[in-house]
Each structure stands twice: as C-alpha cells, then as structure tokens.
Interface confidence: medium
Amino acid sequence: RKIPKVGHTFFQKPESCPPVPGGSMKLDIGIINENQRVSMSRNIESRSTSPWNYTVTWDPNRYPSEVVQAQCRNLGCINAQGKEDISMNSVPIQQETLVVRRKHQGCSVSFQLEKVLVTVGCTCVTPVIHHVQ
Amino acid sequence: GITIPRNPGCPNSEDKNFPRTVMVNLNIHNRNTNTNPKRSSDYYNRSTSPWNLHRNEDPERYPSVIWEAKCRHLGCINADGNVDYHMNSVPIQQEILVLRREPPHCPNSFRLEKILVSVGCTCVTPIVHHVA
C-alpha cells in the first residue's frame, strides 16, 4: 500500500511543497515530540495479573535502532494468592509502529518505510473454549 | 543518529548515522498487517480489564486512523462477572512513530512524529497510600 494522497478538496497541494522524484517521498527523521516520555503507572509489568518482561531489540540499519518488545511471563494469569491460574490466559497486546529501514545494495544506500508490530504488554482474558462435537 | 558498520570497499563510507532527511520509497514494507484492532482480536471484550476502542482520525498523519483504548472500568472483572475494586484496570501506553505531512497538506513530504497511544488495558494490584 502506498501512502495515500490527500484527497480532500481543501487540501490542495500548496505551492511550497518540495519537489520529490516519482515513486518516492521526502522524509525528515528529526522526530517531532522526540522528548515526550511515557507516564505509565509504576512497574505495571510486574503488578499485572498477566505480567510481562521487556526485551530490547537492536538493529543498526533501522531507525530507531532500539525497539522494545514485551513477552508475557505466563500462559495463565496470576490469581489473588499469587499463583498461576491456567483457567485464564495471559495474551499479548500489540501495536503497529513505523520504522525506517536502511538497505545496502553494493555501495548504494536506499531507505524503506516499514511497519513493525510491537508487543506492548499483556492482558488477562477468559479463554475461548472450543467444544468438540 | 545511529552508527552502522562501515563497508570498507565503498568510497565515502563515513555515513555511519542516518541522515536528517532521506528519500523513501512510497511503498511500505509489511503494509498488510491489520490496522483495526476490533477485527484482529476480541481481547478488548474478553479481558478482565476490558476496554473500548476510539477512532482517532487525522488526514495530515499517516496512518490517518489510529485506535485509542479507554479502560471501561476502574476495577477489574472478577470470576462472578462483577467489577472488583481490589484490583485496578490501567491503560498500557506505547510511543509509536507516525508520519506528519510537512509542510501541511503536501502529498509526498513528511516528518516522523512520536505519539503516545493507549493500546489496551491490563489488571494490576493497586498501590494503596494510607494516610497516617
């Protein structure tokens, strides 16, 4: 899928748009809101009934190079007694983000946008039970 | 910027960092992943900390539609189907990168933007602060 053109009538292409070669787009990777911080509740990954761990993946040819992935610690959920209850399921919650991939072909370098699926954390769900006829 | 290993066989191999501005192919790799969380799973309804999904639309952004989660309850759903306030539903937030049209309305010129989205909710033990 290509990036959609802006279709609304009031979004006429302004005169000030930079010239871009066909089939490509200009991308400024100086990130807007670079310094904003997630103000998530304290260590919810440990306090959750479906706790998770974090792993940092590193790829020097990706921007950003670091992507943090969560993995659920258990198949079941943690009950009030602190024990794993396998009648419930810990499942990953995922979110798409964009990254820029650098590709080397010989000595030339090209850049490609890529959608990456990030596991953000886990939640505890009631399982779907499939009854056998 | 990001440092990359040099290829000694190439001339002018000092570009260890990503340049500030790059020309990118319009086609997006892995573009076919499902962007509607309602269609991809029903965890939002089956979770002990269920959430509603709200559509956030902005034509100046790619992707133009982002789904935001909002926890349905302050507590969590217990085995009886009631909301139990000994536990708390909290949002799981994530910073993601999107494209912002820059200058505005331009069809093929973008800047990366970091935004904070609530992806879903999880059930946690509360931190209780008692007053002395």
């Epitope: 306090r47 | 926890c71 302050l74 909301v83 708390n88 509360p126 931190i127 602060h129 008692h130």
Partner: antibody
C-alpha cells in the same frame, strides 16, 4: 436531553422487598452506566450499586446481600430490587447516569421517596 | 471504606462573598491509572444533586466559572469566588477511586 425518572412504591412494610425502576431517555444504556444512591431524610448520600454499560455490576458490599440490579437496554430501563427492608431504609432513592466509567454521576433523576413503616 | 471528611458542616455567607469548602479523604484518591476521582455536587433545597466539578478541577457543562476545584492526594477544596443566591444548598464531595463510592457528610451553604 438526558433524563432519568425513578418509580417505586411510596410505602413498604418492614421485612418486605421493594422494586424500583429507572426509566431513561436521551442516552443509551449500552453506552453508559447507571447508579443508585439513597438519602435518608435530613442526611447525606449513600451509594448503593451501579450497573455498567456492558452489564457488569458493582455493589456496595455492606448492602450486597439485599440488593439486585438488572437492566433492559431495549426498554431503556434499569431495575433495582431490595430485600428485607427495615425502618432505616426510609429514604429518597435516586438513579443517576455515570459519566463514562469515571464514577461521576453527571445526571440524576428527581428521586422517589420510600417510607418503611408498619 | 474511604471516609470523606468535609469542613465546615455549615457555612454562613453573604451574597458576593467568597466561600471555601474543604474535603479530606482517609486514603489517597490517586488511582493506579494516574487519575484522581474526586467530584463535587450541589443539592439545592428540595432538588436532586447536580454535578459541579469532576476529577478534582474540571467544571461540568453549564457550571459557572465562579466555581473552582483544586487539591491532590487526600486534600481537596471547592471555592466559589462570588456567592449568588442560586448557590445556596448542600455541597457534597465524593470519591470514586476506591469501592464503595463514598460521599462526604455535606456542607450547608446558607445566608448569614
């Protein structure tokens, strides 16, 4: 506009049970929760129970054994049943809409007065 | 249960005065999600309660800007900058962070 209206018997004998109905308009029960709150004459407010938009419930544990709440989304009605009434259950009973899961009662009914007396 | 303590229980005022009502909770009202579910209601004589302020400081729609809420943790205040006749009645604070939802005993705003 948003409206809630309570109905129920005005006089009940001790040890009897009591049923209230809250009829709503201007919003959907599949989108909002509804609380019940009571106020004894000349006193403060006491929260009883809430039924959330998804049908889940939360009771005041002190009264849970005597209360039962349900709803009919299609009829825009919420029902509250209270058992084993005593004289100290004499109060004005209100239903109120929850302001999107934040335990904020943004719109209230006018209340229905109940006297428990033999 | 979380105990909500309102002071004063009675507040005599003259029209045009500033009025201030305090509400203190027996434990912090900061929820795990970061929000503080402390709300203020006004019950005029012979009427049902009306929402004034939700989540500490947010005025509900149609509430005049002479009403303001502030505070954090366990200590909260409702201020009326210039009391008008329609402001007289019983003011309740309420918390929704911990079940069961609880109310303060009320503060009666009345004319001197």
């Amino acid at each position: 506009q948003v409206q809630l209206k309570e109905s129920g018997p005005a006089l009940v004998a001790p040890s009897q049970s009591l049923s209230f109905t809250c009829t709503i308009s201007g919003f959907s029960l599949s989108s909002y929760g509804v609380h019940w709150v009571r106020q004894p004459p000349g006193k403060g407010l006491e929260w009883l129970v809430v039924i959330w938009s998804d049908g889940t419930t939360t009771y005041n544990s002190a009264l849970k054994s005597r209360l039962s709440i349900s709803k009919d989304n299609s009829k825009s009605q919420v029902f509250l049943k209270m058992n084993s009434l005593q004289t100290d259950d004499t109060a004005m009973y209100y239903c109120a809409r929850d302001g999107y899961y934040i335990y904020t009662m943004d719109y209230w009914g006018q209340g229905t007065s109940v006297t428990v007396s033999s | 249960d979380v105990v909500m303590t309102q002071t004063p229980l009675s507040l005599p005022v003259s029209l045009g005065d500033q009025a201030s009502i305090s509400c203190r909770s027996s434990q912090s009202l900061v929820h795990s999600n970061g929000n503080t579910y402390l709300h203020w209601y006004l019950q005029r004589p012979g009427q049902s309660p009306k929402l004034l302020i939700y989540k500490v400081s947010n005025r509900f729609s149609g509430v005049p800007d002479r009403f303001s809420g502030s505070g954090s943790g366990t200590d909260f205040t409702l201020k009326i900058s210039r009391v008008e006749a329609e402001d007289l009645g019983l003011y309740f604070c309420s918390q929704g962070t911990h079940a069961p939802l609880t109310f303060g005993a009320g503060t009666k705003l009345e004319l001197n």
